[in-house]
C-alpha cells in the first residue's frame, strides 16, 4: 500500500481500519468504492456493495471526501452524505452531510471538494455508505474521492 | 503548547504525533512548516525540509488544511496535495488532493480553505509533504494553514 | 446513539470522546451544542455553556463542521473558529480557523460548509469552544453542524 508492501502483521489484535478510494464505475447510489488496489486499506471491517460493515461495536472516526467538478457550471445543488443502515432499523440515518449551492460562476469549468469527518458509536452489523446528489459530477481519482474509518 | 507547558512525559511509549503550522517564508514547493513555536507538536516523528519523516511503520491519520486568499479574484486553479516520497520508489505518490476552480467572483477579495484528512499505511523512512499550486495565495497563520498526523 | 443503544460499558478505562451537534437555540457566541439527544457522544469530557471541558491532560484530535447557508447571497465574510480558554491565561487561543469571502453569486440562494480538524496538546481545565461570524447564517441540523474530539 502507498507503493510498498504492508508491514508484517503484529501479534497484537489488528486495528479495525478502512480507506477506500473512488471507483469510476459507480452507476447509482450509494457510491461504490475500490477496496483492493492502490492506497486502499481494509482490515477488521468488511466491504459489501458500497458499504463498510462494522463487525465490532465501539467508537469509530468516520470520514469521506468527494471531489465534484464540471465542464460548465450551472450551480446544481450538490450534496454529500455519510449514512448508516442497520437491518434492525427501518430508516437510513444520516451521520454527516455537506451541501453546496451557488458555488461557481455560470458557464465556467469548475471544481470543488466536500470533506466530512467525525466520531460515532457504531454497532456490529451497521452498514455505512456514501451518497452524492449528482453522480455525473464526481471525479473518482483515488487521491480526490475517498471513504474511510478507524476504530478508536 | 496551546499557551501552557507540555504535560510531564508519561512512562509509556510516546505517541507518534505531529502538528505543524504555516511558515510564511516558504519560497518554493514543498511548503515549509513551523516546527518549534506556537501550537506545534512533534513527537516520535522528524521534520526535515518541509517533510514529516516516518520512523515507525504503521497506520497513521494524516491531515492538512491550507487557507488560500487573494485581494482580487481571478479564479486561478488552486490545488492542495499531500504526497509521499520514499528513496526506494522513483515517483512521488499523491495521497490526498483538493482542487478548486471557479470559486470566487472576479475582482473581489476572496478567501477559501481546503481540508484533507485520511488514514494511510506508512513505512519507516517515508517522507510526507504538502504542495500547493499558488504559493502567493496562501496565508500562513498558524490557525489557518497546518499539516499533521498521528499514529493510530 | 445512531439509532441503537450504547454498547455495555467495558471494564477498561472509558475513552475520552465527544461529538456534539448543532443546537438551533444558540443566540450568541460561543455556539451552543446538543449534548443529550440524537447522535451525540459525551464520555470523559464535560460540556458546559457551549464548551467542552478537558479533565485529563493529553493529546486530542479536535474537529468541527459548520454549515452556512442563506436565502440571498451578499457575500458577508464568514469565519468559523475553534478556540481554547483557560482561567490561567488571559486570552482566548484560536486553535483552528476557516474563513470564506466571495463564495457565492450575489442574490442567489447559497450553501457552504467549513470543516476543521487537528491534533492538540490539551491540559486539564482547558475549555474548547466554537465561534462563527454570522450566527443567522448557520443551519444547525445534527448531520451538518457539529463539534467533537477524542483523546488519542
Amino acid at each position: 500500500q502507498i507503493g510498498h508492501p504492508s508491514p508484517p502483521p503484529e501479534k497484537k489484535e489488528l486495528r479495525k481500519v478502512a480507506h477506500l478510494t473512488g471507483k469510476s464505475n459507480s452507476r447509482s447510489m450509494p457510491l461504490e468504492w475500490e477496496d483492493t488496489y492502490g492506497i486502499v486499506l481494509l482490515s477488521g471491517v468488511k466491504y459489501k456493495k458500497g458499504g463498510l460493515v462494522i463487525n465490532e461495536t465501539g467508537l469509530y472516526f468516520v470520514y469521506s471526501k468527494v471531489y465534484f467538478r464540471g465542464q460548465s457550471c450551472n450551480n446544481l445543488p450538490l450534496s454529500h452524505k455519510v449514512y448508516m443502515r442497520n437491518s434492525k432499523y427501518p430508516q437510513d440515518l444520516v451521520m454527516m452531510e455537506g451541501k453546496m449551492m451557488s458555488y461557481c460562476t455560470t458557464g465556467q469549468m469548475w471544481a470543488r471538494s466536500s470533506y466530512l469527518g467525525a466520531v460515532f458509536n457504531l454497532t456490529s452489523a451497521d452498514h455505512l455508505y456514501v451518497n452524492v446528489s449528482e453522480l455525473s459530477l464526481v471525479n473518482f481519482e483515488e487521491s480526490q474521492t475517498f471513504f474511510g474509518l478507524y476504530k478508536l | 503548547q496551546i499557551g501552557h507547558p507540555s504535560p510531564p512525559p508519561e512512562k509509556k511509549e510516546l505517541r507518534k504525533v505531529a502538528h505543524l503550522t504555516g511558515k510564511s517564508n516558504s519560497r518554493s514547493m514543498p511548503l515549509e512548516w513551523e516546527d518549534t513555536y506556537g501550537i506545534v507538536l512533534l513527537s516520535g516523528v522528524k521534520y526535515k525540509k518541509g517533510g514529516l519523516v516516518i520512523n515507525e511503520t504503521g497506520l497513521y491519520f494524516v491531515y492538512s488544511k491550507v487557507y488560500f486568499r487573494g485581494q482580487s479574484c481571478n479564479n486561478l486553479p488552486l490545488s492542495h496535495k499531500v504526497y509521499m516520497r520514499n528513496s526506494k520508489y522513483p515517483q512521488d505518490l499523491v495521497m490526498m488532493e483538493g482542487k478548486m476552480m471557479s470559486y470566487c467572483t472576479t475582482g473581489q477579495m476572496w478567501a477559501r480553505s481546503s481540508y484533507l484528512g485520511a488514514v494511510f499505511n506508512l513505512t519507516s523512512a517515508d517522507h510526507l509533504y504538502v504542495n500547493v499550486s499558488e504559493l502567493s495565495l496562501v496565508n500562513f497563520e498558524e490557525s489557518q494553514t497546518f499539516f499533521g498526523l498521528y499514529k493510530l | 446513539q445512531i439509532g441503537h443503544p450504547s454498547p455495555p460499558p467495558e471494564k477498561k478505562e472509558l475513552r475520552k470522546v465527544a461529538h456534539l451537534t448543532g443546537k438551533s437555540n444558540s443566540r450568541s457566541m460561543p455556539l451552543e451544542w446538543e449534548d443529550t439527544y440524537g447522535i451525540v457522544l459525551l464520555s470523559g469530557v464535560k460540556y458546559k455553556k457551549g464548551g467542552l471541558v478537558i479533565n485529563e491532560t493529553g493529546l486530542y484530535f479536535v474537529y468541527s463542521k459548520v454549515y452556512f447557508r442563506g436565502q440571498s447571497c451578499n457575500n458577508l465574510p464568514l469565519s468559523h473558529k475553534v478556540y481554547m480558554r483557560n482561567s490561567k491565561y488571559p486570552q482566548d487561543l484560536v486553535m483552528m480557523e476557516g474563513k470564506m469571502m466571495s463564495y457565492c453569486t450575489t442574490g442567489q440562494m447559497w450553501a457552504r460548509s467549513s470543516y476543521l480538524g487537528a491534533v492538540f496538546n490539551l491540559t486539564s481545565a482547558d475549555h474548547l469552544y466554537v465561534n462563527v461570524s454570522e450566527l443567522s447564517l448557520v443551519n444547525f441540523e445534527e448531520s451538518q453542524t457539529f463539534f467533537g474530539l477524542y483523546k488519542l
Epitope: - | R69, Q71, S72, N74, T106, G107, Q108, M109, W110, A111, N139, E141 | N74, N75, P77, S79, K99, M101, S102
Partner: antibody, heavy 119, light 106 residues
C-alpha cells in the same frame, strides 16, 4: 454619517519614517476593508495598500512593498500606515478609503494628509 | 498589470452641455469599473460602480456604460458643480486608475 480622518503627515527626510493614522466613525469599522490611496501633487490617483476587515490579510502596491506596513486597531476604529525608507517619489496626499463590500473600489474617502519627502 | 487610458485629458464645456468621457482598459475588465469625481483640494467621490450603477445620492444626470475594454461616463446636462477632474478605476484585477480627465468651463 461615515467619516474618515487622516493625520500624521508632514515633512520628512529621505530614508526616514513616518506613521499615518486614519480615524473612522459613523460605521462598523471592524466589518470593512480599508485602503490607502495616494496622489502626488498635480498627478493622478495611485492605490497603495489594503487591509482586510479583521486585519488578517494585507496587500501592497509593488512600489511600496517591503517599505510600508498597513495595520488597524478595531478596538480604536483606527487604521495606520507605517512608512519606512521614504523616497522623494512618496511625496503625495495620502487618503484612507473604505472598501465597498470587498469589491476593491471606494465608497467613502478621508480628506487626505500631505506627506512631503525632501532633504 | 491592466492599464487604464482616459480621453480626453482635458475637456472644455459649458453649463447645459452633454459631455462624454471615455476610459479604455488594456484588456477586458468585464464591468468591473468605477468612476470618481474630484474637486481641487478635496477627496474623490464615488459616482458609478460596476460600469453603470449609480451610487446612492449621485444626481441622475450622471450615467455610465460599457463593458470589456471600452467605457464611458456621460453627464447629460452639465451643472456648475460638475466642473472637476474625473477618474476611472478598474477592479477586475487588483486596482488601477486612469490618469484623469479635467472638465473645465469653456
Amino acid at each position: 454619517q461615515v467619516q474618515l480622518v487622516e493625520s500624521g503627515g508632514g515633512v520628512v527626510q529621505p530614508g526616514r519614517s513616518l506613521r499615518l493614522s486614519c480615524a473612522a466613525s459613523g460605521f462598523t469599522f471592524s466589518t470593512y476593508g480599508i485602503h490607502w490611496v495616494r496622489q502626488a501633487p498635480g498627478k493622478g490617483l495611485e492605490w497603495v495598500a489594503v487591509i482586510w476587515y479583521d486585519g488578517s490579510d494585507k496587500f501592497y502596491a509593488d512600489s511600496v512593498k517591503g517599505r510600508f506596513t498597513i495595520s488597524r486597531d478595531n478596538s480604536k476604529n483606527t487604521l495606520y500606515l507605517q512608512m519606512n525608507s521614504l523616497r522623494a517619489e512618496d511625496t503625495a496626499v495620502y487618503y484612507c478609503a473604505r472598501d465597498r463590500d470587498n469589491w476593491n473600489y471606494f465608497d467613502y474617502w478621508g480628506q487626505g494628509t500631505l506627506v512631503t519627502v525632501s532633504s | 498589470d491592466i492599464q487604464m487610458t482616459q480621453s480626453p485629458s482635458t475637456l472644455s464645456a459649458s453649463v447645459g452641455d452633454r459631455v462624454t468621457i471615455t476610459c479604455r482598459a488594456s484588456q477586458s475588465i468585464s464591468s468591473w469599473l468605477a468612476w470618481y469625481q474630484q474637486k481641487p483640494g478635496k477627496a474623490p467621490k464615488l459616482l458609478i460602480y460596476q460600469a453603470s450603477s449609480l451610487e446612492s445620492g449621485v444626481p441622475s444626470r450622471f450615467s455610465g456604460s460599457g463593458s470589456g475594454t471600452e467605457f464611458t461616463l456621460t453627464i447629460s446636462s452639465l451643472q456648475p458643480d460638475d466642473f472637476a477632474t474625473y477618474y476611472c478605476q478598474q477592479y477586475n484585477s487588483y486596482i488601477t486608475f486612469g490618469q484623469g480627465t479635467r472638465l473645465e468651463i469653456k
